[in-house]
């Protein structure tokens, strides 16, 4: 058994406040 290092959350989907790139004016899917 090996300890697995912590990993981050999934990459934020478009529309999420932490999604990469500019936020579109139109809604997009996160959650």
């Amino acid at each position: 058994w090996q300890h697995q290092p912590d990993s981050g959350p999934p990459a934020a989907a478009p529309g999420h406040p932490l999604a990469p790139g500019p936020h579109p004016a139109a809604p997009s899917s996160w959650g």
Epitope: A12, L18, A19, S28, W30
Partner: antibody, heavy 120, light 107 residues
């Protein structure tokens, strides 16, 4: 059981700062984003900000940017929000809320809430 | 920001009654809507996500639906523990925004 336990109520003077905590348990802290919400007395909810506990990335509501600071302590699975230059408008209950950024676990677990009263 | 208009703001109903709460979105949110329940002690619990999917442990008397830009939460037969505040939340676009809430009271 997944839980978000928040620090107790605080009374602060106008112009002061407050730092509240949110201790996560029952899940991998770094695997979910942590959001903060505001609920003024008798009113609806408002999203303030979010942090990625894994790398410290943050995003803020335009309304609060510059006054709210989010941080985490990964070793204790605790998220913090500091609010500066407080006014009576900041008197509210503040909730931490987790989300995974994409899937069904979006705002699925809410903290117990921290009541902040700003009064001289 | 997307505006969520929730109605009614308050509602008095009797045990066993069927009630519906509605939220209207100012823009298309593509079913990215949740319903939250807040008890008098401040505890908040998510009931529904993606417009109509019930969270685990939520009683089947709760249901969610959509008609155009109107999203509804229906409680088929009210029980005493259902008297609380309810909020809708859109998460299609940043920032996430909430409806103004509905206070559900016992008649």
């Amino acid at each position: 059981e997944v839980q978000l336990r928040q620090s107790g109520p605080v009374l602060v003077k106008p112009g002061a700062s407050v730092k509240m905590s949110c201790k996560a348990s029952g899940y991998t802290f770094t695997g979910y984003y942590m959001n903060w919400m505001k609920q003024s007395h008798g009113k609806s909810l408002e999203w303030l900000a979010v942090i990625n506990p894994y790398n410290g990335d943050t995003a803020y509501n335009r309304k609060f940017k510059g006054r709210a600071i989010l941080t985490v302590d990964k070793s204790s699975s605790t998220a913090y929000m500091e609010l500066n230059s407080l006014t009576s408008e900041d008197s509210a209950v503040y909730y931490c809320v987790r989300d995974d950024g994409y899937h069904v676990r979006f705002f699925d677990v809410w903290g117990t809430g921290t009541t902040v009263t700003v009064s001289s | 920001d997307i505006q969520m208009t929730q109605s009614p703001s308050s509602l008095s109903a009797s045990l066993g009654e069927r009630v519906s709460l509605t939220c209207r979105s100012s823009q298309d949110i593509s079913d990215y809507l949740s319903w939250l329940q807040q008890k008098p002690d401040g505890t908040i619990k998510r009931l529904i996500y993606s417009t109509s999917t019930l969270d685990s442990g939520v009683p089947k008397r709760f249901s969610g639906s959509r008609s155009g830009s109107d999203y509804s939460l229906t409680i088929s037969s009210l029980e005493s523990e259902d008297f609380a505040d309810y909020y809708c939340l859109q998460y299609a676009s940043s920032p996430p925004t909430f409806g103004g809430g509905t206070k559900l009271e016992i008649k």
